[in-house]
Interface confidence: low
Amino acid sequence: MADNFSLHDALSGSGNPNPQGWPGAWGNQPAGAGGYPGASYPGAYPGQAPPGAYPGQAPPGAYPGAPGAYPGAPAPGVYPGPPSGPGAYPSSGQPSATGAYPATGPYGAPAGPLIVPYNLPLPGGVVPRMLITILGTVKPNANRIALDFQRGNDVAFHFNPRFNENNRRVIVCNTKLDNNWGREERQSVFPFESGKPFKIQVLVEPDHFKVAVNDAHLLQYNHRVKKLNEISKLGISGDIDLTSASYTMI
């Protein structure tokens, strides 16, 4: 994740916003998109939470009326939202490297409200050129969002926007192996807004995940779990109303 990367850079980009032929819907990819090698803050940001607070989770006993960090999943049938556009990301027609995902997507949850936390099965794991798309709306007064790409009990990629960590908005990415979290990678560009709809796209590349929000490239995260085919579930949790979660090959 680039430590000096800004949304302005992402939006201005280069003359060729899609240097690798990604669908235009991916968003204004900056020049040399592959040139952000997951730089992080080694040793820095050792979890600077205010006393008694747990970054990304509601402080125990706080927020009366909201038991725990996630104040309840939406009931089925509420929070209607726009349907996902199944044709939004046309396939390139190229089969995936493993053949596990023919380029005919998307697959995943139907459009409409989904119960959060939500698990999206990824039956063959993830493969390069796989595009995962999540549509939803951030709840008012949101505290956190989390995407967890899971390999068994491990979390290969934890993408965690935090709306109020030490009075700052920050996105934290990490990996959890054998129940131990590794080095955090932090991104201060924060494209989410309480009460507003969002689109998160995660593109799997051979050596990293690439994340775009609302059609603008946000960050990339180098693979720490190398067995991509074993990353078989995406957990979606936090303070959101979830409209759809799907994947396709591009």
């Epitope: 050792p46 979890g47 939470a49 747990y54 970054p55 990304g56 989770q57 125990p60 038991p67 725990g68 960090a69 996630y70 309840g72 936390p117 698990n119 899971q150 068994g152 009990n153 965690n160 934290v172 990490n174 959890k176 054998d178 129940n179 131990n180 979290w181 955090e184 579930k233 957990g235 949790s237």
Partner: antibody, heavy 121, light 107 residues
Amino acid sequence: EVQLQQSGPELVKPGSSVKISCKASRYTFTDYNMDWVKQSHGKRLEWIGYIYPNNGGTGYNQKFKGKATLTVDKSSSTAYMELRSLTSEDSAVYYCARSYYDGSYDAMDYWGQGTSVTVSS
Amino acid sequence: DIQMTQTTSSLSASLGDRVTISCSASQGISNYLNWYQQKPDGTVKLLIYYTSSLHSGVPSRFSGSGSGTDYSLTISNLEPEDIATYYCQQYSKLPRTFGGGTKLEIN
């Protein structure tokens, strides 16, 4: 405030099994690991393992594999630990504890009151 | 497994004293250390997480410090309700392991 209410004391015979419960309230049960800890003779604490209620994923201390089995019932927000082939070594107080993790943090932030298990013929 | 050692198994102090309880790990644990308090009735509470972060609702007279293999819990102004046994716990590697406990008594 988060609450973890454990089942009452158990007096059981050697060789038998026992299943103790931990009912969680005032937080979203599926969002946090539930850990279990053993305390023998009022002294050292030993971590048994954890279960993630959302997907049933577990992790055990090798020492307790085959001895303890962790399960959950999401509908009642209750975690269970079954201990089998009991011997006098298993006589102890057993605690459930909610654990949170995030980045550098991993701690058991709320504990049940403990369940005493006595193995005696 | 990582061994956690609390060399002082019991400690006697007077009200108002500053008390320090120490804990050492058999290998470096990168500040991945928590402190718990167990009252005589068996009630267990988290006091400090990640070496020095105070858990919600814990009085500010409790503080934690340390690095590498050596860590400590300090109570700056001992109160009657602090009578308890204090345990350190590492989470650098599974299995999580606890120290043997330090029982704090009032003179």
